[in-house]
Interface confidence: low
Amino acid sequence: DWVVAPISVPENGKGPFPQRLNQLKSNKDRDTKIFYSITGPGADSPPEGVFAVEKETGWLLLNKPLDREEIAKYELYGHAVSENGASVEEPMNISIIVTDQNDNKPKFTQDTFRGSVLEGVLPGTSVMQVTATDEDDAIYTYNGVVAYSIHSQEPKDPHDLMFTIHRSTGTISVISSGLDREKVPEYTLTIQATDMDGDGSTTTAVAVVEILDANDNAPMFDPQKYEAHVPENAVGHEVQRLTVTDLDAPNSPAWRATYLIMGGDDGDHFTITTHPESNQGILTTRKGLDFEAKNQHTLYVEVTNEAPFVLKLPTSTATIVVHVEDVNEAPVFVPPSKVVEVQEGIPTGEPVCVYTAEDPDKENQKISYRILRDPAGWLAMDPDSGQVTAVGTLDREDEQFVRNNIYEVMVLAMDNGSPPTTGTGTLLLTLIDVNDHGPVPEPRQITICNQSPVRQVLNITDKDLSPHTSPFQAQLTDDSDIYWTAEVNEEGDTVVLSLKKFLKQDTYDVHLSLSDHGNKEQLTVIRATVCDCHGHVETCPGPWKGG
């Protein structure tokens, strides 16, 4: 029959070429001479010329070695024609299967694989997976079936079988306990992939296993005992740097130190922070230390890590003896700001108050006093006793120096230490009002018509405080009452001035006496311009010849 079974041809054949594979045969050759030909990829289309057919005999020929990894199967068509070119058979399918030879080694997908595993993990923990491929056939043969193995391990500590690799998946796992990053931070495994399921060609790659840090080492103080000297009163003063060593990975949470003052800081005077680079504990004063109260502190500091320990580890403790050094401290006014009530206008030489300072130092130091700032120059201070006396007139109504009835003075105390130190205090004199100002009208110049005149309302002001102010009383003097009247309104804070008789156009003096609730009297001359006009006027109309 005009049929050919699939033909199997091994790749990489040695020849000689052309090599006869199979013979095409049509039973029509009994009747006529038959010519044979083949078509298809590998014959008359790319890759052309791999196969040919002997035109007359029908022998199918292979012209060159085949490569299964390039083309694994060829599908050709056989044709049979008579001498006159007429087709005598239907085109016949010819399948040529290229059988595999183990001509490709396995290839790892990377030259170097990288993985990591935590130190101290249990055997069986998976680390990483490596992969190798082989272009040969792995379905019908073992040529492309890859088996993995570990050829060598560097270093061989704690022994040479720390890892295993799954023969078929390439998964690398821990096989032994004892992974310790502090001893071996990285292993280099030479891994092999062998085809023929382990019996064939081998290729190698490197698997680098990084051992990740676990917090299995406690930080340790070195040294454990410290002595430090600190001047009293210093805040934020660096007392001591505490040094620790930690075998875990530098700059990791398992290495970074956390310090805690466990004891000896009852007054909460100290604080400890971690230096970000050196990992040292920096002990500083949170508050000033007081030599007079306590001249030595013994602190106990414990160190741990930012990360918790993965197993129970003993913690390291350091002892720091802090010696407080005496410092000549400044005298302190008691209270720092003193409020004293004093009547304004007291006589010169009159005592105002005594304002003294205390020296925190234990020795009985002599303190001397002086006034540092006295804007109006109203006061003096005895250098020995701190007695403040008036040397000028204290005036509550002096707006340049007095604000809200308070006159502020700064005083200074100086001890006789070496070197001497000074402290300042603030003396706030609250000036008590005295009825030393009479009422004053505003404005003091008026313009008024001599016909149907408008009443002139004048505001009354008094620099003193109540009760030395309203209600006010008004009185006209020096015959001013012949032409004018003056009346204080019901509220008692304005005076109404009225023209009661005709005056010719001119300028007149009106003598107005105002007295306050404390009968303090003040005479004021009001300058009144009288105009020839009716009712309300601002200025006199027409030519004005008045003086």
Epitope: N102, D103, K105, D111, S152, E154, T188, T190, T202, T203
Partner: antibody, heavy 121, light 107 residues
Framework: VQLVEQSGAELVKPGASVKISCKAS????????MNWVKQRPGKGLEWIGR????????KYNGKFKGKATLTADKSSSTAYMQLSSLTSEDSAVYFC??????????????WGQGTRVTVSS | ELMMTQTPASLSASVGETVTFTCRAS??????LAWYQQKQGKSPQLLVY???TLAEGVPSRFSGSGSGTQFSLKINSLQPEDFGSYYC?????????FGGGTKLEIK
């Protein structure tokens, strides 16, 4: 007996190319790497690169990328190295050498006799 | 790139003496080092691979040692045929590099 036979000496002009060959016999050519090594007169050895004839995979020393091209013909068990844009610096003896797999990594166990290339106008 | 440094560059010795060549790698190459002998006008011959394994047919007076970055080749009781140049080469991962060589001459 494993043998690695190299082609004869070449005299070439500057700027030209040359292709030298290395024929292997007595072992599985397809499944062993073939390496190429350069030796200038009176100097040491320089590794150029290698090829795996089974699938044509190549690895080069960066210094020779673009200068050397490695190929192999499985059917004739022959490895080739083409050197291009030749200058006097390329005048040297070129060796091919088989790299055998010892189950770990590789050393060069069979060497060709060397091909002398002289670049001169 | 891995650098291989060989010392000394040249050495004079007499037949019967013992000589040692050293080779230093710029980084850890574990045991992946080979030694080759080359005589004038000839191709190199493999002596030692994997730092200490003698190649087939190499006399037992040759011995290799070392790992990591420091390696040495020792020849006991020098024979006349031992004179020539000796090269180390790492065979860890490409690119493979050779040392500059040591020339062994008759004193």
């Amino acid at each position: 007996v494993q043998l690695v036979e190299q082609s004869g000496a070449e005299l070439v002009k500057p700027g030209a190319s040359v292709k030298i060959s290395c024929k292997a016999s007595g072992y599985a050519f397809s499944t062993s790497w073939m390496n190429w090594v350069k030796q200038r007169p009176g100097k040491g050895l320089e590794w150029i690169g290698r090829i795996y004839p089974g699938d044509g995979e190549t690895k080069y020393n960066g210094k020779f990328k673009g200068k050397a091209t490695l190929t192999a013909d499985k059917s004739s068990s022959t490895a080739y190295m083409q050197l291009s844009s030749l200058t006097s610096e390329d005048s040297a003896v070129y060796f091919c050498a088989r790299q055998r797999d010892y189950g770990a990594l590789y050393a060069l166990d069979y060497w060709g006799q060397g091909t002398r290339v002289t670049v001169s106008s | 790139e891995l650098m291989m440094t060989q010392t000394p560059a040249s050495l004079s010795a007499s037949v019967g003496e013992t000589v040692t060549f050293t080779c230093r790698a710029s980084e850890n190459i574990y045991s992946y080092l080979a030694w080759y002998q080359q005589k004038q006008g000839k191709s190199p011959q493999l002596l030692v691979y994997n730092a200490k394994t003698l190649a087939e047919g190499v006399p037992s007076r040759f011995s290799g040692s070392g790992s990591g970055t420091q390696f040495s080749l020792k020849i006991n009781s020098l024979q006349p045929e031992d004179f020539g140049s000796y090269y180390c080469q790492h065979h860890y991962v490409p690119p493979y590099t050779f040392g500059g060589g040591t020339k062994l001459e008759i004193k």
